[in-house]
C-alpha cells in the first residue's frame, strides 16, 4: 500500500485554485488524465478529463474546471475558477490506463473554501478571468468513471491514508461536455 499525503489549500469564494500534477513523461504523456473529487463514503468522482489521447497544451474546460496537459513539462495543470464554499473537499489527479485502475498522482489536494473577501484593493486577477469570457466551442469526450468495487470507498482522514490500486476494469460510460478555451499568456 502507498501512503498518500495531502496538501491543503484554504481559499476564499471567487478565487482560483491552480495546481499542477507531475507525471512520468515516457509512460503517460498522451494518456487521458482526469481531476476527481473524493467524498466520504463514495467512490472518487471524475469532474473533468482531458481528451483521449491527451493533447499537448490544449485547454479543456468543464464548467469551472480547466485542464491543460503539458507533455513537454510532464505536468497536468488544473484550475478551478470562481470557487464556491461547496467546492470544499478532497481532490486528486489520475491517469487512465485501461484495463488497470487509474494511476493516482501525488499528492491529494484538500481544498477548503470559505466565504469572505477574496482579494486586496487594486488586486488584479485578469490573467485568468479573461479566459472565461470567451465564447467557447463545445465537443463531447469520454470521461471514464472510477467504479472498481475494490477501491477504497471512504475518504482518508486529513493526514494520510493507505490506498491500494489493484488491477480491474474501468467503466467507460460517462459522457461529459468538454469546452475548449484559448489560453492567454
Amino acid at each position: 500500500a502507498t501512503k498518500l499525503t495531502e496538501e491543503k489549500y484554504e481559499l476564499k469564494e471567487g478565487q482560483t485554485l491552480d495546481v499542477k500534477c507531475d507525471y512520468t513523461l515516457e509512460k503517460f504523456a498522451s494518456s487521458q488524465k482526469a481531476w476527481q473529487i473524493i467524498r466520504d463514503g463514495e467512490m472518487p468522482k471524475t469532474l473533468a478529463c482531458t481528451e483521449r489521447p491527451s493533447k499537448n497544451s490544449h485547454p479543456v474546460q468543464v464548467g469551472r474546471i480547466i485542464l491543460e496537459d503539458y507533455h513537454d513539462h510532464g505536468l497536468l495543470r488544473v484550475r478551478m475558477v470562481n470557487l464556491q464554499v461547496e467546492d470544499s473537499g478532497l481532490y486528486q489527479c489520475v491517469i487512465y490506463q485501461p484495463p488497470k485502475e487509474p494511476h493516482m498522482l501525488f499528492d491529494r489536494i484538500r481544498l477548503v473554501v470559505t466565504k469572505g473577501f477574496s482579494g486586496t484593493p487594486g488586486s488584479n486577477e485578469n490573467s485568468t478571468q479573461n479566459v472565461y469570457k470567451i465564447p467557447p466551442t463545445t465537443t463531447k469526450a469520454l470521461c471514464p468513471l472510477y467504479t472498481s468495487p475494490r477501491t477504497v470507498t471512504q475518504a482518508p482522514p486529513k493526514s494520510t491514508a493507505d490506498v491500494s490500486t489493484p488491477d480491474s476494469e474501468i467503466n467507460l460510460t460517462n459522457v461529459t461536455d468538454i469546452i475548449r478555451v484559448p489560453v492567454f499568456n
Epitope: 507525471y23 489536494i109 486577477e125 490573467s127
Partner: antibody, heavy 119, light 108 residues
C-alpha cells in the same frame, strides 16, 4: 521527520567546478520536485534550478544556464548540482529545497552549503 | 520573468504591535504566492502559501491575503521570535520562480 543535508561546498577559483549533494530522508524522494536556491552574502534568495519528481524535467535560472546541471539519484535519495565555469558572482550559500507536489513552493529546506568563488 | 517587489525594505515595530508587509508582482500570479521567514544563520521557513494558507505549525498570528498582483503578510502581534527577514515568492506558470528582495522586521 523530513531532513535535507547539503554538502560539497568550498572555495574554488573562477572557472573551476564543484558538485553539490543534498541527501534527503523522511519522505518519498522520487515523488517530489526538488530545487536549489542560493543566497549571496547579505543578499536575498535566488532560485537556481529545479528537477521534477515523476517527469524528471529540469529548469534553470538564466544566470546559470549552460554552466550548472541538476540531477538526482532516486535510489540514493540524493539531489545534485554540478557547477562548472564558476564565477565570482556564484558565491553564495546553496540550499536544496523540497517542493510541494502540487506547486513549486518550498516547504522544507536544508541548512545550506557555502560556495566561495575567489582568486 | 515575473519581478517581485517588497515594501518596505525595513519595518521597525515594537513587540506586541501589528506588522504589515507588502509584496507586488509585475504581472498577475493569481494566488500562486508564498511567504517565507528567515532568521540570521538559518534556512528560510515556509509561512504562507496560496497567498493565504498557513503552512503546518505556523501560528495564527501570521496571515496572508491578496491575489493577482498585490499581496500582504500580516503579523497581528509581534513576538520576539518574529523579528527576521521575510520573503515573498511567486510560483505561477513556469520557472524561473522569483523572490522579492525581502523585508527586514526589526525591533523598534
Amino acid at each position: 521527520e523530513v531532513q535535507l543535508l547539503e554538502s560539497g561546498g568550498g572555495m574554488v577559483q573562477p572557472g573551476g567546478s564543484l558538485r553539490l549533494s543534498c541527501a534527503v530522508s523522511g519522505f518519498t524522494f522520487s515523488r517530489y520536485a526538488m530545487s536549489w536556491v542560493r543566497q549571496a552574502p547579505g543578499k536575498g534568495l535566488e532560485w537556481v534550478s529545479e528537477m521534477r519528481g515523476s517527469s524528471g524535467s529540469t529548469y534553470y535560472a538564466d544566470s546559470v544556464k549552460g554552466r550548472f546541471t541538476i540531477s538526482r539519484d532516486n535510489s540514493k535519495n540524493t539531489l545534485y548540482l554540478q557547477m562548472n565555469s564558476l564565477r565570482v558572482e556564484d558565491t553564495a550559500i546553496y540550499y536544496c529545497a523540497k517542493e510541494f507536489s502540487s506547486n513549486s513552493l518550498f516547504d522544507y529546506w536544508g541548512q545550506g552549503t557555502l560556495v566561495t568563488v575567489s582568486s | 520573468e515575473i519581478v517581485m517587489t517588497q515594501s518596505p525594505a525595513t519595518l521597525s515595530v515594537s513587540p506586541g504591535e501589528r506588522a504589515t508587509l507588502s509584496c507586488r508582482a509585475s504581472q498577475s500570479v493569481n494566488i500562486n504566492l508564498a511567504w517565507y521567514q528567515q532568521k540570521p544563520g538559518q534556512a528560510p521557513r515556509l509561512l504562507i502559501y496560496g497567498a493565504s494558507t498557513r503552512a503546518t505549525g505556523i501560528p495564527a498570528r501570521f496571515s496572508g491575503s491578496g491575489s493577482g498582483t498585490e499581496f500582504t503578510l500580516t503579523i497581528s502581534s509581534l513576538q520576539s521570535e518574529d523579528f527576521a527577514v521575510y520573503y515573498c515568492q511567486q510560483f505561477y506558470n513556469w520557472p524561473p520562480w522569483t523572490f522579492g528582495q525581502g523585508t527586514k522586521v526589526e525591533i523598534k
